[in-house]
C-alpha cells in the first residue's frame, strides 16, 4: 500500500486591499488535487496578530478568508490541506504547513504618531474622533484621518477637520450608513517636511462607542403615603427605549439618599413625610442588549421639589 | 465572460525597456494568478513570469530573470511586465494568460508583438 | 529544468480518422500536465488540465491521459476545425516548461 499524501496550498499570502486593516488571506489548491477528485479537500487556516498569544483556527471549502486585523502590528498565518477520512479509507491525511506573514513597513519612531485618540459615537447618530499630535512634532507635522467600514468600496478621507494652531486634531464624520455592528477601520497618518510620521491603526464598532443625550422631562408623582415615583422621558434621537440603562442619583434634603441602575423611565423611591427637599438627575448609557459597551451620557438637569408637603400633589417642573 | 485585452504592438531598439499591459475583465481578478508566455517567430511557446493573485510571490525562469518585473494593480484589474535591457531574442508575440486553480493556464490574451531590432 | 519532449513533430491525418500525441517529461511530474491548441493566427486555447480533465467547452473528443512522465492527447474523430499546433505543458515545478509542439494537418 502506497501512503497517501497531499500537498500544501499554493501560493498562500495575505493581500491588503487598502481597508486598513480589512485583509483577504488567499491560497491556491495543491498541485496534483485532482487525484481526490471525488472527494471534497478542506483547509485548516490559522492565523493572528503577532504577539498574540491565540491563534483563530478556520476550517473552509474555499480559497479565501476575510477578517480585520491591527496593523499596528505584524500578522502571521500558516494553512494545510486535510484529507477527510473518507478520502482515504481510514485516518485524516494533512498536508504540511505553509505559512506567510504581513505587516506594514513603519516609518517614523514611534513617538511621532497621535497620542490620546478618542472617538465618540454622540447619540448614535454623530461620530467624532479627536487626537493630540505626537510628541516632540513640529508645527508643519499634519495628520490625516482615512476610515473604512464594509459597505464602503473604498477608504474615505475625512473632509471636517477640526484644527487647533493650524494642525488637524480632530475629525467630525459626515452621516456613516449602515455603519453600526461591523468593524470600522481608522488610519491616522501623517506628514512633515522634517521626519517621516508612523501610522496609527484603530478598530471598534459604533455601537460600542455611543454617548446618548441624557434623559429629559423629569417628574415626580407621589404613589402613595412612602412612596414617590421618579419618571423621565427617554432623550431625542434615533436610540430605541429597549437600548437605554439609567442611572439616578437622588438627594433628599441635601444628603445624598439613593444611586441606582435601573432598565426603565421610572424609580420608585420610599420616603418619609419629613422630606421637605427632593432633587433627583438621571444619566443614560446603551446598554447590554444593544451593545457590548457604551459611555455615560452627561447628567440631565435637576429636577427639584421643594417647600410643600410631597403628599399633597403630583409634582411636576 | 473572461476576457483579456492586451496592449499594442511595441517596436523597441537593443537594449531599451518597454512596459506591457492587460486589461482583465469578466472574473474576480485579484483571486487568480497571472502569467506571461512568448512565443518567438515560427516558435513554440516559452513561458516568461507567473504573478500570485495578491501579487506577493512571483515566478521567473532564468533566461528573463533580473531583467522583466510582472506586476499588477487589482485596483484596475491590469496585469504588466516590464522588459528591460531587451535583446534581439525577446523578439516575440507575448500573451498574458490566467493561471487556473490548477496553475494551468486557462484563458489567453490575444497577444501583443515585440519587435527588437536595431 | 524538466523537458517535455512532444511527437511527432507533424501529424498528417485524414478528416475523421482518430489521433493521438504524445509528451514524455524528463521526470516525474505526477498528473501536472496541460494541453493548449492553437489554430493558426490565434493564441493558444486551453484543452485540458490534470493530464485528463476538459475545460469546459473543448468538445469531448478531445481526451487526455497519463500520469508521471507520460502523457497523450487523443483525438477521436478529427475535424477540419482541429488544424492547429499542440503543446503540452508541465505546471508540476517552476520553471513551467512547454513541449515543443505537434503540428496537425490535413493530408
Known amino acids: 500500500d502506497t501512503e497517501i499524501k497531499v500537498n500544501p496550498p499554493q501560493d498562500f499570502e495575505i493581500v491588503d486591499p487598502g481597508y486598513l486593516g480589512y485583509l483577504y488571506l488567499q491560497w491556491q489548491p495543491p498541485l496534483s488535487l485532482d487525484h481526490f477528485k471525488e472527494c471534497t479537500v478542506e483547509y485548516e487556516l490559522k492565523y493572528r496578530n503577532i504577539g498574540s498569544e491565540t491563534w483563530k483556527t478556520i476550517i473552509t471549502k474555499n480559497l479565501h478568508y476575510k477578517d480585520g486585523f491591527d496593523l499596528n502590528k505584524g500578522i502571521e498565518a500558516k494553512i494545510h490541506t486535510l484529507l477527510p477520512w473518507q478520502c482515504t479509507n481510514g485516518s485524516e491525511v494533512q498536508s504540511s504547513w505553509a505559512e506567510t506573514t504581513y505587516w506594514i513597513s513603519p516609518q517614523g519612531i514611534p513617538e511621532t504618531k497621535v497620542q490620546d485618540m478618542d472617538c465618540v459615537y454622540y447619540n448614535w447618530q454623530y461620530l467624532l474622533c479627536s487626537w493630540k499630535p505626537g510628541i516632540g512634532v513640529l508645527l508643519d507635522t499634519n495628520y490625516n484621518l482615512f476610515y473604512w467600514y464594509e459597505g464602503l468600496d473604498h477608504a474615505l478621507q475625512c473632509v471636517d477637520y477640526i484644527k487647533a494652531d493650524g494642525q488637524n486634531i480632530g475629525c467630525r464624520f459626515p452621516y456613516l450608513e449602515a455603519s453600526d455592528y461591523k468593524d470600522f477601520y481608522i488610519c491616522v497618518n501623517g506628514s512633515s517636511e522634517n521626519k517621516p510620521i508612523r501610522s496609527s491603526y484603530f478598530t471598534f464598532q459604533l455601537q460600542n462607542i455611543v454617548k446618548p443625550l441624557p434623559p429629559v422631562y423629569l417628574t415626580f408623582t407621589r404613589e402613595s403615603s412612602c412612596e414617590i415615583k421618579l419618571k423621565w422621558s427617554i432623550p431625542l434621537g434615533p436610540i430605541p427605549a429597549r437600548c437605554f440603562d439609567y442611572e439616578i442619583e437622588i438627594r433628599e434634603d441635601d444628603t445624598t439618599l439613593v444611586t441606582a441602575t435601573v432598565e426603565n423611565e421610572t424609580y420608585t423611591l420610599k420616603t418619609t413625610n419629613e422630606t421637605r427637599q427632593l432633587c433627583f438627575v438621571v444619566r443614560s448609557k446603551v446598554n447590554i442588549y444593544c451593545s457590548d459597551d457604551g459611555i455615560w451620557s452627561e447628567w440631565s438637569d435637576k429636577q427639584c421639589w421643594e417647600g410643600e408637603d410631597l403628599s399633597k400633589k403630583t409634582l411636576l417642573r | 465572460q473572461v476576457q483579456l485585452v492586451q496592449s499594442g504592438a511595441e517596436v523597441v531598439k537593443p537594449g531599451a525597456s518597454v512596459k506591457l499591459s492587460c486589461k482583465a475583465s469578466?472574473?474576480?481578478?485579484?483571486?487568480?494568478?497571472m502569467s506571461w508566455v512568448r512565443q518567438a517567430p515560427g516558435q513554440g511557446l516559452e513561458w516568461v513570469a507567473t504573478?500570485?493573485?495578491?501579487?506577493?510571490?512571483?515566478y521567473y525562469p532564468e533566461s528573463v530573470k533580473g531583467r522583466f518585473t510582472i506586476t499588477r494593480d487589482n485596483s484596475t484589474s491590469t496585469l504588466y511586465m516590464e522588459m528591460r535591457s531587451l535583446r534581439s531574442d525577446d523578439t516575440a508575440v507575448y500573451y498574458c494568460?490566467?493561471?487556473?486553480?490548477?496553475?494551468?493556464?486557462?484563458?489567453w490574451g490575444q497577444g501583443t508583438l515585440v519587435t527588437v531590432s536595431s | 529544468d524538466i523537458v517535455m519532449t512532444q511527437s511527432p513533430l507533424s501529424l498528417p491525418t485524414t478528416l475523421g480518422q482518430p489521433v493521438s500525441v504524445s509528451c514524455k517529461a524528463s521526470?516525474?511530474?505526477?498528473?501536472?500536465v496541460a494541453w493548449y491548441q492553437q489554430r493558426p493566427g490565434q493564441s493558444p486555447r486551453a484543452l485540458i488540465y490534470?493530464?485528463?480533465y476538459r475545460y469546459s467547452g473543448v468538445p469531448d473528443r478531445f481526451s487526455g491521459s497519463g500520469s508521471g512522465t507520460d502523457f497523450t492527447l487523443t483525438i477521436s474523430r478529427v475535424e477540419a476545425e482541429d488544424v492547429a499546433v499542440f503543446f503540452c505543458q508541465q505546471y508540476n515545478a517552476y520553471p513551467l516548461t512547454f513541449g515543443g509542439g505537434t503540428k496537425l494537418e490535413i493530408k
Open positions: 490534470s493530464a485528463s
Open positions: 504573478i500570485s493573485g495578491g501579487g506577493s510571490y512571483t
Open positions: 469578466g472574473f474576480t481578478f485579484s483571486s487568480y494568478g
Open positions: 521526470q516525474n511530474v505526477d498528473i501536472n
Open positions: 494568460a490566467r493561471r487556473d486553480l490548477r496553475s494551468a493556464m486557462d484563458y
